[in-house]
Amino acid sequence: KLTIESTPFNVAEGKEVLLLVHNLPQHLFGYSWYKGERVDGNRQIIGYVIGTQQATPGPAYSGREIIYPNASLLIQNIIQNDTGFYTLHVIKSDLVNEEATGQFRVYPELPKPSISSNNSKPVEDKDAVAFTCEPETQDATYLWWVNNQSLPVSPRLQLSNGNRTLTLFNVTRNDTASYKCETQNPVSARRSDSVILNVLYGPDAPTISPLNTSYRSGENLNLSCHAASNPPAQYSWFVNGTFQQSTQELFIPNITVNNSGSYTCQAHNSDTGLNRTTVTTITVYAEPPKPFITSNNSNPVEDEDAVALTCEPEIQNTTYLWWVNNQSLPVSPRLQLSNDNRTLTLLSVTRNDVGPYECGIQNELSVDHSDPVILNVLYGPDDPTISPSYTYYRPGVNLSLSCHAASNPPAQYSWLIDGNIQQHTQELFISNITEKNSGLYTCQANNSASGHSRTTVKTITVSAELPKPSISSNNSKPVEDKDAVAFTCEPEAQNTTYLWWVNGQSLPVSPRLQLSNGNRTLTLFNVTRNDARAYVCGIQNSVSANRSDPVTLDVLYGPDTPIISPPDSSYLSGANLNLSCHSASNPSPQYSWRINGIPQQHTQVLFIAKITPNNNGTYACFVSNLATGRNNSIVKSITVSASGTSPGLSAGA
């Protein structure tokens, strides 16, 4: 059966609707759409002839209708007047007609609503407020939201006037919220801007802060009063009943015992006309002066001097406290406190003892802190370091050496070459060096305060030819599967390539081998006995190359599980028993034997002449490597048979 479906059924003004035709018959001549529930030539919208694929507008055509070849009708830019029924008239090829009617409803796009109120400043526990959602719109549903949530269930909330009006009875401060209304129809939904309900309330009983009621003489008294109130409360202060000032905060500097008494804060709300008060009792105590630290040595020398810090003034029956680096005193044999804790002595000061140091005097209420004191510990100079670390240079380059030594006060520096003083600077610069600049370069650091001097000597070689390198190692006897070894190719030279060989071959690819420091350092991680090879490093530049002597890595390993030989376990009575134990180990292990758990001899070979069945039992060989700290053992069972009772047995050695 021919049917018409409207998509959508409810259409918004300005949008479009499609009258979709279902079950269209076969063999058609054409079809026509009409406004209304019947075929009426005066209300024809559009016709369509299939043979010519030609659409023809009718008297009711508005310019907004488009007919599809499948007879469906699209209407654009819908207006309110389009609401209603539409009839499709189908003409078959046999000129038999068929009709079907569809309909849709048009609704306006709703405007954004707004909220009106009958009371902009309701008073808590007294007034009611009625919100109304504007405008009043036909066929619209009204909804309300409080803080973007649907309305809570409450006997104080009432909806009326088709939900257009929301009344709040006996408002409270908790009703101070964001209120929105929403209008809905079948094609649109719009929410208003939020309206914040301004509920007048309070003042509640004020709170005075801070809560502490005990103060020391000389302190500042700073009291703050706060009472929940809308609009904000106006505040007044009274001391012992006498009006002081109309402020939220009361400030009295440098208080004395005379400022003790009752302090009253009064809060007043001019809109509600209410007053509330709170009273606090303040007690002011006499107080000792602020402590300070004196020192018997303001510039102590490291590892030489002791320093005694004393907390002043001396007050009877007072507890003295100390802090270093804002922490309580650490336990240290170099820190000593006097019996009354007033003097802190630092024995043999170090550069790490600079502080800051604070002392404190404890009274009934709190602890008074001194200002911090920092010690100026004189130290150094430490052994100076010369950088860069290169010892080999090519002729023609610039030599720039820098010297640094930890020192307080900062060190004064001098440079000597082959024992001859050059200059009193921290840096030494020689341009365009030649072989003649080779020699011993000494940096001397001097601390004028302590009178100490330290020197460092560096050998500088200037040569076009590279020197024969050597290999240094951080671990001469590494333990297998435990240690790493770092080989370094010496010397460090500028513009030089470093190469490595193992057993005369270039380095194998291995995750345990790592080159660093510009290939100058070769690290072997988790060494194994197979790493005990000959290692050679080479250096080369554009004019020369040289190789080091080989260094053989001595890997400590084992002992592995020992092997007892011969393997025989059955012997004839009267034979000689000659057992030899061997375990792979570097260095060679120490051997010991146990028979049936009883210690025997500390030899690699166990020899027993003319054995008897009494020599039956378990023979254990124990091996230990003192260098690796590891041990191992193996147990062998020996059976001795009487002569001639067990053919085929070994005759022994």
């Epitope: 300005g14 479009e16 559009i46 659409a55 507008p57 055509y61 508005s62 310019g63 907004r64 209708e65 488009i66 007919i67 599809y68 699209l74 654009q76 830019n77």
Partner: nanobody
Framework: EVQLVESGGGLVQPGGSLRLSCAAS????????IGWVRRAPGKEEELVAG????????RYADSVKGRFTISADTSKNTAYLQMNSLRAEDTAVYYC????????????WGQGTTVTVSS
């Protein structure tokens, strides 16, 4: 009576320009979407451009984007198609049509105006 009357066609050399007009009567073009459809022998009918005055939107076929511009003068109830950089493949009969804003459907019933692009 509802009518769409096209004009402005003619012979033009490749690279030349033409301006087609579509005079509507019996309805207001400001309430609907109006456009241009072209038919050429051996080719599929193509909706080349459309304008919806009530939304202010326009649409173009990829083949004419950047070359053709559709516009409307609601006071004259007339739509226009400015055709620039014309090519031989633009040769066709151009019909003024009622078009959909969002779908690929349209109706036309005028006589059309012929555009020939040839050197």
């Amino acid at each position: 009576e509802v009518q769409l009357v096209e004009s402005g066609g003619g012979l033009v050399q490749p690279g030349g320009s033409l301006r087609l007009s579509c005079a509507a009567s019996g309805f207001n073009i400001k309430d609907t979407c109006i456009g241009w459809v072209r038919r050429a022998p051996g080719k599929e009918e193509e909706l080349v451009a459309g304008i919806c005055e009530y939304t202010g939107s326009t649409r173009y076929a990829d083949s004419v984007k950047g070359r053709f511009t559709i516009s409307a003068d609601t006071s004259k109830n007339t739509a226009y198609l400015q055709m620039n950089s014309l090519r031989a493949e633009d040769t066709a009969v151009y019909y003024c049509a009622i078009v959909s804003q969002s779908r690929s459907v349209y109706n036309y019933w005028g006589q059309g105006t012929t555009v020939t692009v040839s050197s």
